[in-house]
Amino acid sequence: MKVLQEPTCVSDYMSISTCEWKMNGPTNCSTELRLLYQLVFLLSEAHTCIPENNGGAGCVCHLLMDDVVSADNYTLDLWAGQQLLWKGSFKPSEHVKPRAPGNLTVHTNVSDTLLLTWSNPYPPDNYLYNHLTYAVNIWSENDPADFRIYNVTYLEPSLRIAASTLKSGISYRARVRAWAQCYNTTWSEWSPSTKWHNSYREPFEQH
């Protein structure tokens, strides 16, 4: 039994890191393998992650971690019974994929303005709380070409757009994702989408 693709890990910079790897053949990850991990810190202890299958030869492990800080470094040991298959390390702050924003809501009752709000996925004491920026994707269910992205580069988790920038009388969907420039993170997954019917009063033409 050998590791074909070494584990690569990504952290949510809060409490979970996800490591994926591939073996050289079909493997029952949960019965044959264990991933041991330990924070390099005086008061830490070793933990064991039981991997799950991720395709025939692929394995994935969800590591429960202490609250992350930038200096953290974890040792990783992949075992098959008594055999050490791979040894490595992982700095969560260097491989961050933020959590997806939640609670996306479209408020349509503000005088021909659409107000989209969502929740920051981090608690206020987490470093990323004040460092996330967002991308909001709005698209028409009726017209695949009517697809737009709004970049929200300020900290407030909201976006205002004029209802008239979208077509009236049809349904739209929106979703939002996050990233943090400070740690050069990847984008989060998209939030669940939310749907609304766009309608607004056309202004009277004056002749």
Epitope: S15, F41, L42, L43, S44, E45, M65, D66, D67, V69, S70, A71, D72, P123, P124, D125
Partner: antibody, heavy 115, light 109 residues
Amino acid sequence: EVQLVQSGGGLVHPGGSLRLSCAGSGFTFSRNAMFWVRQAPGKGLEWVSGIGTGGATNYADSVKGRFTISRDNAKNSLYLQMNSLRAEDMAVYYCARGRYYFPWWGQGTLVTVSS
Amino acid sequence: EIVLTQSPGTLSLSPGERATLSCRASQSVSSSYLAWYQQKPGQAPRLLIFGASSRATGIPDRFSGSGSGTDFTLTISRLEPEDFAVYYCQQYGSSPPWTFGQGTKVEIK
């Protein structure tokens, strides 16, 4: 908002005992190492003890064998049991949350050791 | 045992002036594990700088940290009235694992 609220300080005779408490809120207590740091009157800061998320502990040589740090994650609480207290233990004791450094501190509680 | 020595013991300056505080370690300290705190009378310390040069949340940009190895510096570019306090450096490393410098008092001239 992160809060660390301390209690349990007071006056004790040399050789006596005291238990300090620190209640945490506004964060996931169980995922954080916790510490005690003290400051004698007019002096600098001195690390006393730390406890990891899994219960591993460490002590400054000056308190080893006399002080015991513990935590109750169900109650979001940190404790310091101080026995065989000496005059040199007199200080303001702070609980702190952190790891390599301490971003969050309690308000401090004064322990006076005097006959 | 790593000993942190801060200098000067007291710094007498006027508001608007630049303050430069030194922290010297008896042996090399990882930059990742060097921090600076501010403490005012009757208050708990407040983290200013971690990782030798990263500002903690909510700390004004007039505070900056630098250095590596055994020599570290905290600089306050323009002293504000609320900056007059005692400043401590702190390291995490070998036994004892957490140690503080003895402090530098920044007082009004």
